[in-house]
């Protein structure tokens, strides 16, 4: 009972994950730059995303622009769109092959697979995991590097986005559901023969170090 | 307009020492990195020393890093490089550089000083 | 440190011609570069940076490109204006390091 629990806890979380990394992916506020002209009239927010641009006036109004060459685009956001989408389909890959192991399907009889599917399961979530956070922690990264680069112009600058809280947070959903789905795979084969005992071993689930405290900018 | 005015260049020995000055003007120089990149006779330029505005950060490459040091004086709107154990391949001319909001890199250059190293 | 690799030293063209400077990193610099013109004379001024941003009043015969570690300063129709020494310079990291320069004169 404690290990089906665990099971829906873990593909709970995951999918909790994957809407957050979708969310993430999707959302134009990867970084943030606070624009203020001489003129507070021109006080604006710049969001750029993966996929589009958007300028916020101080009066409230939004306007996007989507990227319009795939090939002009800097190689850095090339790589994390993909590694962005390839993240998505291996955790909806991850989800059908336990949906196929689940205790509550039938799609597979024997116990012993039914605990293998699982376990695959949570290592292809493990995996969508870290492809999260490559691209999350790459952008960080080179806004961290930017805030502490002197010969970087102010208005080059930018903030961590609120899109990368979310692919923190999806990262780390991701790699606690998929462990939790690692480690109930031994107590779901243990009710079937003991030599199936051999064939699995429990492995510590993947830890994520979490972002240390970032610099962000006050604006006055 | 922006001005800056680099003073204090002159002959001096090996091993000894000398301050250069820079006058700014034209702007808010408290809101500005500034830095000072040298130039050696017929060779490329090269990077000396970048402070941050305010003057919390010094950033310096490893060839003056102990023997040079640079300061700002926000009332005077004046910066300085201090230049200890000078040495031959000190001899340059030594252009202040003031940052820029929108662009990267070394924005404004002064016209520069000569410093010459020889006994 | 990052070495920067300029190219050609120097090179002699017609009023009118395109001109093509390039500039290679030992590594990778993402586009953290700028472009100088150093006119005989006279200090330094910042012509591009981050590869391809134009200063305000710098003629748009000037434009920079980057392709992974290479970079391009082109100007597309030689001015005898544009006779002075052009320098790329990296700011990725610490330490910031010049190319050697391109002396560049008018046949």
């Known amino acids: 009972m404690a290990s089906a629990g665990m099971q829906i806890l873990g593909v709970v979380l995951t999918l909790l994950g994957w809407v957050n990394g979708l969310v993430s992916c999707a959302l134009p506020m990867w970084k943030v730059t606070a624009f203020i002209g001489n003129s507070i009239v021109v006080a604006q927010v710049v969001w750029e995303g993966l996929w589009m641009s958007c300028v916020v006036q101080s009066t409230g109004q939004m306007q996007c622009k989507v990227y319009d060459s795939l090939l002009a685009l800097p190689q850095d956001l090339q790589a994390a769109r993909a590694l962005c989408v390839i993240a998505l389909l291996v955790a909806l890959f991850g989800l059908l092959v336990y949906l196929a192991g689940a205790k509550c399907t039938t799609c597979v009889e024997e116990k012993d697979s039914k605990a293998r599917l699982v376990l695959t399961s949570g290592i292809v979530f493990v995996i969508s995991g870290v492809l999260t956070l490559i691209p999350v922690c790459w952008t960080a990264h080179a806004i961290i590097r930017d805030f502490y680069n002197p010969l970087v112009a102010e208005a080059q600058k930018r903030e961590l986005g609120a899109s990368l809280y979310l692919g923190w947070a999806a990262s780390g959903l991701l790699l606690l559901g998929g462990g939790l789905l690692c480690c109930t795979c031994p107590s779901g084969g243990s009710q079937g023969p003991s030599h199936y005992m051999a064939r699995y071993s429990t492995s510590a689930p993947a830890i994520s170090r979490g972002p240390s405290e970032y610099p962000t900018k006050n604006y006055v | 307009e922006v001005q800056l005015v680099e003073s204090g260049g002159g002959l001096v020995k090996p091993g000894g020492s000398l301050r250069l000055s820079c006058a700014a003007s034209g702007f808010t120089f408290e809101d500005y990195t500034m830095s000072w990149v040298r130039q050696a006779p017929g060779k490329r330029l090269e990077w000396v020393v970048t402070?941050?505005?305010?003057?919390?950060?010094?950033y310096y490459p490893d060839s003056v890093k102990g023997r040079f040091t640079i300061s700002r004086d926000e009332a005077k709107n004046s910066l300085y490089l201090q230049m200890n154990s000078l040495r031959a391949e000190d001899t340059a001319v030594y252009y202040c550089?003031?940052?820029?909001?929108?662009?990267?890199?070394?924005?404004?250059w002064g016209q520069g000083t000569l410093v010459t190293v020889s006994s | 440190d990052i070495q920067m690799t300029q190219s050609p030293s120097s090179l002699s063209a017609s009023v009118g011609d395109r001109v093509t400077i390039t500039c290679r990193a030992s590594?990778?610099?993402?586009?953290?570069l700028a472009w100088y013109q150093q006119k005989p004379g006279k200090s330094p001024q910042l012509l591009v940076y981050?590869?391809?941003l134009l200063v305000d009043g710098v003629p748009s015969r000037f434009s920079g490109s980057r392709s992974g570690t290479q970079f391009s300063l082109t100007i597309s129709s030689l001015q005898p204006e544009d006779v002075a020494r052009y320098y790329c310079?990296?700011?990725?990291?610490?330490?910031?390091?010049f190319g050697s320069g391109t002396k560049l004169e008018i046949k």
């Open positions: 590594e990778n610099i993402d586009s953290y």
């Open positions: 981050a590869s391809t």
């Open positions: 310079q990296h700011y990725y990291s610490i330490p910031y390091t």
């Open positions: 402070i941050s505005s305010g003057g919390g950060r010094t």
């Open positions: 550089i003031r940052g820029d909001y929108r662009y990267d890199a070394f924005a404004y």
